[in-house]
Interface confidence: low
């Protein structure tokens, strides 16, 4: 009778084992071991026992001891079980960002590992087991579906293999995959709200605000604001689940025309975009042109108003005829026109909005000098010793210089309070002089002597 020891062995892959083959008869004709494994016989005294070292055991094997005794041939098998931990434990790659409410399929692949009967695959979120299954197939694959929730944000998912050899007197061998960190997000289906001027004048600044509610996690949202292809640099303010991006936009003559204002919000692997049209316009104030800003009385003056080619102008409240960018009026300058304002108002329609600009010019009319009866009476009669103020006002632009002299030497004190005396009496020649010319007027002062009763 042939026997083998040990009858069962569990050993690590590539390991060695000593197997003893024995027979019950004293003088066996034959005693040996049949195995594909590399073997080395250890020499022992006696004929009925042999010890072999079997090495480099890579897989499960059943070496067989045999002996040939007078009463016949017999055999005995030993069962070698090889154990090894998996060579690959991997979660199938997934986008790191996942929208809340989506079903996320976690797939773990396990290559190698034995004995399979003792190998289990566990899918975990943090330390919480989501699924536990025996490893089946090569590679073994275990899947589970997770409904993505907001509170999963930042959670680590992993896959672990457990090779449990504790029943065989060994230990529990664990292998864990690289973790997959889930980033959850919510990007609402509504596009961002974009508030901006619909029209913007060249060489001015406007403010653009882009906002969106219902985002998670709001701090991870990227905001791109652009006018045409000019990237804007917004200041972003965050709320609990909202943001507001405010940017100042400056436009130049090069930007004139219809521009696209874009606000794009990118969160996770999704984006929402709002486009709006902004019309950038150039509209200088209208030009008021006077033939000459300073003219002499009686001169023909042309007042012209010129504005943007598409504008409509009114000059001193009178619309251009025909309605358009130019208007003019003709006048003969009178003293009353001195200091007169000529105001041009231009209106331009830009993208359905009416824009108004004004310009005013003043006319100076040179006239005079003038001395007339109303302002410089030709005759005064005053009682002697009374207090009087001689008044004579010369008119003109520029204001004339006025002198009233008697006999070419004695001045009449114009505008001063005087005590009337006999020597004030007489005829004075009042002379008003300016760059526009000279006029004279005779003024007579009569002094009434008091009657002595």
């Amino acid at each position: 009778q042939t026997s083998v020891s040990p009858s069962k062995v569990i050993l690590p892959r590539g390991g060695s084992v000593l197997v003893t083959c024995s027979t019950s008869c004293d003088q066996p004709k034959l005693l040996g071991i049949e195995t594909p494994l590399p073997k080395k016989e250890l020499l022992l005294p006696g004929n009925n026992r042999k010890v072999y070292e079997l090495s480099n055991v890579q897989e499960d094997s059943q070496p067989m001891c045999y002996s040939n005794c007078p009463d016949g041939q017999s055999t005995a098998k030993t069962f070698l079980t090889v154990y090894w931990t998996p060579e690959r434990v991997e979660l199938a790659p997934l986008p790191s960002w996942q929208p809340v409410g989506k079903n996320l399929t976690l797939r773990c692949q396990v290559e190698g590992g034995a004995p399979r009967a003792n190998l289990t695959v566990v899918l975990l979120r943090g330390e919480k087991e989501l699924k536990r299954e025996p490893a089946v197939g090569e590679p073994a694959e275990v899947t589970t579906t997770v409904l993505v929730r907001r509170d999963h944000h930042g959670a680590n998912f992993s896959c672990r293999t457990e090779l449990d050899l504790r029943p065989q007197g060994l230990e529990l061998f664990e292998n864990t995959s690289a973790p997959y960190q889930l980033q959850t997000f919510v990007l609402p289906a509504t596009p961002p709200q974009l508030v901006s001027p619909r029209v913007l004048e060249v060489d001015t600044q406007g403010t653009v605000v882009c906002s969106l509610d219902g985002l998670f996690p709001v701090s991870e949202a990227q905001v791109h604001l652009a006018l045409g292809d000019q990237r804007l640099n917004p200041t972003v303010t965050y709320g609990n689940d909202s943001f507001s991006a405010k940017a100042s936009v400056s436009v130049t003559a090069e930007d004139e025309g219809t521009q696209r204002l874009t606000c794009a919000v990118i969160l996770g692997n999704q984006s929402q975009e709002t486009l709006q049209t902004v019309t950038i316009y150039s509209f200088p104030a209208p030009n008021v042109i006077l033939t000459k800003p300073e003219v002499s009385e009686g001169t023909e003056v042309t007042v012209k108003c010129e504005a943007h080619p598409r504008a409509k102008v009114t000059l001193n409240g009178v619309p251009a005829q025909p309605l358009g960018p130019r208007a003019q009026l003709l006048l003969k300058a009178t003293p009353e026109d001195n200091g007169r304002s000529f105001s041009c108002s231009a209106t331009l329609e830009v993208a359905g909005q009416l824009i108004h600009k004004n310009q005013t010019r003043e006319l100076r009319v040179l006239y005079g000098p003038r001395l007339d009866e109303r302002d410089c009476p030709g005759n005064w009669t005053w009682p002697e010793n009374s207090q009087q103020t001689p008044m004579c006002q010369a008119w003109g632009n520029p204001l004339p210089e006025l002198k009233c002299l008697k006999d070419g030497t004695f001045p009449l004190p114009i505008g001063e309070s005087v005590t009337v005396t006999r020597d004030l009496e007489g005829t004075y020649l009042c002379r008003a002089r300016s760059t526009q010319g000279e006029v004279t007027r005779k003024v007579t002062v009569n002094v009434l002597s008091p009657r002595y009763e």
Epitope: H224, A226, L227, G228, D229, Q230, R231, E254, D255, E256, G257, T258, Q259, R260, T262, A264, L275, I280
Partner: antibody, heavy 118, light 111 residues
């Protein structure tokens, strides 16, 4: 300021092909860039564009058939799975400085010919 | 789907004459329309944008007009160098609506 397309050649149906537009004299960080094609003897067909920030936008008919990307000095158009109907001259063009509109194309490359045939 | 229809597809005129090309949009695009000229073997060249504004360096013999859905390109005092195909293009809306779309083209033959 100039644009030059390259990469056009004879390919068999289904073989992905990438065309490159090399720009000089201006910065891609300030302009939107478009791709337009023209089949032999036919009219112009707008494919799509990529913005200064790198976001790509495609005409409805072109979605899934083309991919636009860029580096600091080049803009690429990948024809993902060419068919004989994609035989055409492909132009890249710059927009953006007339009223800022991406679609007003004031600078064009000479074009590169792609022939798809088995 | 949005469409730009150009008429006629081909037109012939003598040197010194005038040619009118029409472009009709299937929906209103305000004044967001450009015109391009393309000669054989060359890329297109921008002529007009915003329906009526001449691009830099373009002769004043080219005149664009219209808004909404009806647009016209008029070439007056024709020269032999004007022989080319002319395309209109919308730049209203986004790319998935009408942005970027071209008309079918009009060939101008100068006798």
């Amino acid at each position: 300021q100039s644009l030059e397309e390259s990469g056009g050649r004879l390919v068999t149906p289904g073989t992905p092909l990438t065309l490159t537009c090399t720009v000089s004299g201006f910065s891609l960080s300030s302009y939107g860039m478009s791709w337009v094609r023209q089949a032999p003897g036919k009219g112009l067909e707008y494919i799509g564009w990529i913005s200064f920030s790198g976001s790509a936008y495609y005409a409805n008919w072109a979605k899934g058939r083309f991919t636009i990307s860029k580096t600091s000095t080049t803009v690429d158009l990948k024809i993902t799975s060419p068919t004989t109907e994609d035989t055409a001259t492909y132009f890249c063009a710059r927009g953006g400085d007339y009223g800022g509109s991406t679609y007003i194309l004031n600078l064009w490359g000479p074009g590169t010919l792609v022939t798809v045939s088995s | 789907a949005f469409e730009l229809t150009q008429t006629p597809s081909s037109v012939e005129a003598a040197v010194g004459g005038t040619v009118t090309i029409k472009c009709q949009a299937s929906e209103s695009i305000d004044s967001y329309l450009s015109w391009y000229q393309q000669k054989p073997g060359q890329p297109p060249k921008l002529l007009i944008y915003a329906a009526s504004t001449l691009a830099s360096g373009v002769s004043s013999r080219f005149k664009g007009s219209g808004s909404g859905t009806e647009f016209t390109l008029t070439i007056s005092d024709l020269e032999s160098a004007d022989a080319a195909t002319y395309y209109c293009q919308s730049y209203s809306g986004t790319i998935t609506t009408s942005g970027g779309a071209f008309g079918g083209g009009t060939e101008v033959v100068v006798k």
